[in-house]
Amino acid sequence: EEELQVIQPDKSVSVAAGESAILHCTVTSLIPVGPIQWFRGAGPARELIYNQKEGHFPRVTTVSESTKRENMDFSISISNITPADAGTYYCVKFRKGSPDTEFKSGAGTELSVRAKPSAPVVSGPAARATPQHTVSFTCESHGFSPRDITLKWFKNGNELSDFQTNVDPVGESVSYSIHSTAKVVLTREDVHSQVICEVAHVTLQGDPLRGTANLSETIRVPPTLEVTQQPVRAENQVNVTCQVRKFYPQRLQLTWLENGNVSRTETASTVTENKDGTYNWMSWLLVNVSAHRDDVKLTCQVEHDGQPAVSKSHDLKVSAHPKEQGSNTAAENTGSNERNIY
């Protein structure tokens, strides 16, 4: 009689994570008597996957009634497959004895597991940055298999090219992770902008996963300041305004200084929003000129989002009739209230 052969017809089987894998095995003879066992891997470190007669294998079921004496089909089904189950599975025939001895092994079936990548997580810099600066964004996705994966970066729908991507580990693994860092140059118009990381993988059937970051979390647009003197409202009264424009985020504090002395401090509250997402704010002072013998230097000082203060000054002539004059310094923050100086 022809010697028993162990036939594993499938060289490889690919299964999606969470599904069941069927591993086929048949033998060509009932002789010699002895059990069939399934192992993952070969050699002394091989892992027992299924023993016909004893042990606990809750995820494994036999496809046919393998314990029937005349049965020659020893195919198994492994449920709830995870990437950790990947490997080569061997169907092995043992000869009964003391102890049982390995008689013949099948050629093996390689099980590969298709696992979806996790939703990409995009994170930006810890601190805000101003326009014209370059900031880095990272994108991470984990747990996918096989290793081949494509990652793209977009800013407002426009593909970015300045990025570096790594897939780990480099060698064979049950699953993989991807890490990418993109560099983005900020502009003053980026408050409403988004950075998108897009991951494409065979398991996603052409429907890539996306992770986003809003540049509103990253950008700081410093304000521009303009101090102007309005026409006389009443005899000896001058209205001086400080226009704080195009700033983001809203957190801003404005201080009026009169000849270097603090006159009033206020916090931006009722701001107007521009189309690009930045804010404008205005604060004013009502100055009683007759109370002053000398010229008055009025300074609008703005502290924006915890940054060093910027200011702009205006020289108010007291000697003759007031004329509109101004002198520039710098700018940052808002307020809107009025105050008379006597």
């Epitope: 027992l48 004893e54 102890p99």
Partner: antibody
């Protein structure tokens, strides 16, 4: 549902023989090895042996070899463990188990003169 | 015969503490063939961990198993009152199958 129901407690005299049964349900006894384990009072577990009910092939621990006989009746889905030449140190609870995963409730055998 | 030696013989701990139970084999045991059982007084042993690190059905995730070759460990991350019992390691890598002598986990 897998169940293993063992026969009741036994009191035996030294030198006698005891035969304990283990009736299984929820599976076909031919499909699995049936093991027997001893636990003396306040002591640990000790493997006695096992049977393959499909062909009656047995394996025994050296300590029990020659005094123990494990059998199975596939028509009634019942496994048996017979221990002869009983001595006081054989006083113990005896468990049957299916393939190392499911256990019977145990049978207390007391050997006393 | 493979001799399994468990240590300590008795472990006295309080609920909430971490427990580490060891099982040392006199010769190498494949991790697939190393099981742990829990036994409470008057009850049959229950399969607790199979193939070194896999929890049997219904076993809480605070339990874990690890090891290879001759050294195996059962760990309970934070003890609950119902965890106090005797734990046995068991090898069925080669005949005769053997059990460790057990570790009694008792409330301090």
């Amino acid at each position: 549902e897998v169940q293993l129901v063992q026969s009741g407690a036994e009191v035996k005299k030294p030198g006698a023989t005891v035969k304990i049964s283990c009736k299984v349900s929820g599976f076909n006894i031919k499909d699995y090895y049936m093991h027997w384990v001893q636990q003396a009072p306040g002591k640990g577990l000790e493997w006695i042996g096992r049977i393959d009910p499909e062909d009656a092939e047995t394996k025994y621990a050296p300590k029990f070899q020659g005094r123990v006989t494990i059998t199975a009746d596939t028509s009634t889905d019942t496994a048996y463990m017979e221990l002869s030449s009983l001595r006081s140190e054989d006083t113990a609870v005896y468990y049957c188990d299916r393939g190392l995963a499911y256990w019977g409730q145990g049978t207390l055998v007391t050997v006393s003169s | 015969e493979i001799v399994l030696t468990q240590s300590p013989a008795t472990l006295s701990l309080s609920p909430g503490e971490r427990a580490t139970l060891s099982c040392s084999a006199s010769s190498s045991v494949s991790s697939s063939y190393l099981y742990w059982y829990q036994q409470k007084p008057g009850q049959a042993p229950k399969l607790w961990i199979y193939s070194t690190s896999n929890l049997a059905s219904g076993i809480p995730a605070r339990f874990s198993g690890s090891g290879s070759g001759t050294d195996y460990t059962l760990t309970i991350s934070s003890l609950e009152p119902e965890d106090f019992a005797v734990y046995y390691c068991h090898q069925w890598s080669s005949y005769p199958y053997t059990f460790g002598q057990g570790t009694k986990l008792e409330i301090k």
